[in-house]
Interface confidence: medium
């Protein structure tokens, strides 16, 4: 996955901005072998979103899209 | 003071196309996103599809998908819902509404006046 | 898609009295990201675009009378008109507002007894 703050199929950094909820599509977790752990969220337009797992607001984000893949 | 203002009534025959406009003013118009509900003459209210002004991002209900598209101009503050080929089924009146400013999905905030389509040969 | 169904279609009330409205969906609608329940309540008076009176599941929008309150969780939702006025005769929808498409229900219209 390319786009904010990804490279490779690592991440790189994590994004600072609010995650835009209504634009995302799914989500996965980076690889082990990554040096840095990372969820990315995949927006409706392909955009990849490089997220700390261990922020709040990113598990909340991650069980929503749970709840709307099992909907 | 927040309006959405919509077209005024139109009549139609069968296989005519048509495009209908809601104009948003009285806040930022590409911070919300805009959606279009059909009532039916004595029905209730059926949720078609919402659009994000911001950059045309679009999302119908499976049970619209295809039978309409809808747009947005974000110069003129204007949201649209249009028809290549109209049916006499799709006589009813049709509302804008403004999408609420939640992070998640929202209730409808705001309401345009309505727009009365009538299809009839 | 969310199924919601209303109950009753029509509810006729004396002047004053309480009117109940319930509004059940086929599946829950606890956003898992705000933990609130995602459930609208409208009023569409005749001649009228619907008006928000009541989001997620029990907050009143701005300038709608206190007489409006909205309760439940999961997928059982009621609205309550605790003293019925004239100018509350409508047809009342729920709309769920946790996934796309944000479905109504068919409508409960409230008339005086």
């Known amino acids: 996955a390319r786009g904010t703050n990804v490279g490779r199929e690592c991440c790189l950094e994590y994004f600072k901005g609010a995650i835009p909820l209504r634009k995302l599509k799914t989500w996965y977790q980076t690889s082990e072998d990554c040096s840095r752990d990372a969820i990315v969220f995949v927006t409706v337009q392909g955009r990849a979103i490089c997220s700390d797992p261990n922020n709040k607001r990113v598990k909340n984000a991650v069980k929503y899209l749970q709840s709307l893949e099992r909907s | 003071e927040v309006q959405l203002v919509q077209s005024g009534a139109e009549v139609k025959k069968p296989g005519e196309s048509l495009k209908i406009s809601c104009k948003g003013s009285?806040?930022?118009?590409?911070?919300?996103?805009i959606g279009w509900v059909r009532q039916m003459p004595g029905k209730g209210l059926e949720w078609m599809g919402i659009?994000?002004?911001?950059?045309?991002?679009?999302r119908y209900s499976p049970s619209f998908q295809g039978q309409v598209t809808i747009s947005a101009d974000k110069s003129i503050s204007t949201a649209y819902l249009q028809w290549s080929s109209l049916k006499a089924s799709d006589t009813a009146m049709y509302y804008c509404?403004?999408?609420?400013?939640?992070?998640?999905?929202?209730?409808?905030?705001?309401w345009g006046q309505g727009t009365l389509v009538t299809v009839s040969s | 898609d969310i199924v919601m169904t209303q109950s009753p279609d029509s509810l006729a009330v004396s002047l004053g009295e309480r009117a109940t409205i319930n509004c059940k969906s086929s599946?829950?609608?606890?956003?898992?990201?705000?933990?609130?329940?995602?459930l609208a309540w409208y009023q569409q008076k005749p001649g009228q675009p619907p008006k928000l009176l009541i989001y997620?599941?029990?907050t009143r929008e701005s300038g709608v009378p206190d007489r409006f309150s909205g309760s439940g969780s999961g997928t059982d939702f009621t609205l309550t008109i605790s003293s019925l006025q004239a100018e509350d005769v409508a047809v009342y929808y729920c709309?769920?507002?946790?996934?796309?498409?944000?479905?109504f229900g068919q409508g409960t219209k409230v008339e005086i007894k």
């Open positions: 599946q829950s609608v606890l956003n898992s990201f705000t933990n609130n329940n995602a």
């Open positions: 997620e599941a029990s």
């Open positions: 659009i994000d002004p911001s950059d045309s991002d679009t």
């Open positions: 709309q769920q507002t946790n996934s796309i498409p944000l479905t």
């Open positions: 009285g806040y930022s118009f590409t911070s919300y996103w």
């Open positions: 509404a403004r999408v609420g400013p939640a992070d998640v999905w929202d209730s409808f905030d705001y």
